[in-house]
């Protein structure tokens, strides 16, 4: 039975040209995390593998940085970066936990962080 929950940074906004940290946290489970994937729609951004460490997808190697922790830092943001981002925790023996973050990249300087929320 999957008992864990993923807490994410929720709906967030940031300025064009700036950077943003995407964060997820898996709690309420003793399952072992084997890898965490970060994906934007169907596009792989990064993988953190328990044995090998971080891999940034080569298409994003110049503007995605690993961390902090299991989070991901997006740099040099463009309006095209607006959209859904998913943290996918692969665990044993529980299986897969997925968290969702919506990022809006704004042209103006009125970028505010949304509230944190939980996805069971």
């Amino acid at each position: 039975m999957m008992t864990g929950t993923i807490e994410t940074t929720g709906n967030i906004s940031a300025e064009k040209g700036g950077s943003i940290i995407l964060q997820c946290h898996l709690s309420s489970t003793t399952a072992q995390v084997t890898q965490v994937n970060w994906e934007q729609q169907d596009q792989l951004l990064a993988i953190c593998n328990a044995d090998l460490g971080w891999h940034i997808s080569p298409s994003f190697k110049d503007r995605v940085a690993p961390g902090p922790g299991l989070g991901l830092t997006l740099q040099s943001l463009t309006v095209n970066d607006t959209g859904e981002y998913f943290c996918i925790y692969h665990t044993y023996p529980d299986g897969t936990y997925t968290g969702r973050i919506f990022l809006e990249v704004l042209e103006s300087s009125v970028a505010e962080h949304g509230a944190r929320f939980q996805i069971p």
Partner: antibody, heavy 126, light 108 residues
Framework: QVQLQESGPGLVRPSGTLSLTCAVS?????????WSWVRQPPGKGLEWIGE???????NYNPSLKSRGTISVDKSKNQFSLKLTSITAADTAVYYC???????????????????WGQGTTVTVSS | SYELTQPPSVSVSPGQTARITCSGD??????AYWYQQKSGQAPVLVIH???KRPSGIPERFSGSSSGTMATLTISGAQVEDEADYYC???????????FGGGTKLTVL
């Protein structure tokens, strides 16, 4: 530690078929790796031939023009290369290698070929 | 077909810095890998994903990538570093994977 050992005939006749096997020890052929073949003609550089993932997915060098087939034998913990319509240009040292990946489910996130066999020499001659 | 271009040879004196370049049109959006092959031996992975060094590889080996050029740097080259060095990457569609022509490093 992980070891790879190539085996096969040292001499192949032109127009024949080359069959090579790579025995894997210290790791499971079913683990999350690309199992690869690379060759090196005498006095020349390295040439990537192709690879197979434990799921059965394969990638090949287009220059082989569909002459190559890579397969896995899980019961023997080994993988193989078959190359048809052999010519003198296929004379080379053939290496097998393990390429690790970060995404253990899909094979995405290429780490690199971190373990190699010592190579086996194949000569094509009549 | 996709190509990676390397200089055929590079020579340095012991203790000097050796730089081996690799150029390819897809390198801005692909990773470069570097393999060392000493005479009569199998290749060894010395740099992966542009700049990462596998465990057991000396710190004098480093990698970098900028635009269409990847560079392997050996800081304080030693006689035992004399070998052929191959860059390796993929084309813009992900496959096939391809080796550069190789660079013979002479340390004398």
């Amino acid at each position: 530690q992980v070891q790879l050992q190539e085996s096969g005939p040292g001499l192949v006749r032109p127009s024949g078929t080359l069959s090579l096997t790579c025995a894997v020890s210290g790791d499971s052929i079913s683990s999350s790796n690309w199992w690869s073949w690379v060759r090196q003609p005498p006095g020349k550089g390295l040439e990537w031939i192709g690879e197979i993932y434990h799921s059965g997915n394969t990638n090949y060098n287009p220059s082989l023009k569909s002459r190559g087939t890579i397969s896995v034998d899980k019961s023997k913990n080994q993988f193989s290369l078959k190359l048809t319509s052999i010519t003198a240009a296929d004379t080379a040292v053939y290496y097998c290698a393990r390429a690790r990946v970060y995404d253990i489910l899909t094979g995405r996130g290429y780490y690199g070929m971190d373990v190699w066999g010592q190579g086996t020499t194949v000569t094509v001659s009549s | 077909s996709y190509e990676l271009t390397q200089p055929p040879s590079v020579s340095v004196s012991p203790g000097q810095t050796a730089r081996i370049t690799c150029s390819g049109d897809a390198l801005p959006k692909k990773y470069a890998y570097w393999y060392q092959q000493k005479s009569g031996q199998a290749p060894v992975l010395v740099i992966h994903e542009d700049r990462k060094r596998p465990s057991g590889i000396p710190e004098r080996f480093s990698g970098s990538s900028s635009g269409t050029m990847a560079t392997l740097t050996i800081s304080g080259a030693q006689v035992e570093d004399e070998a052929d060095y191959y860059c390796f990457s993929t084309d813009s569609s992900g496959n096939p994977r391809v080796f550069g022509g190789g660079t013979k490093l002479t340390v004398l």
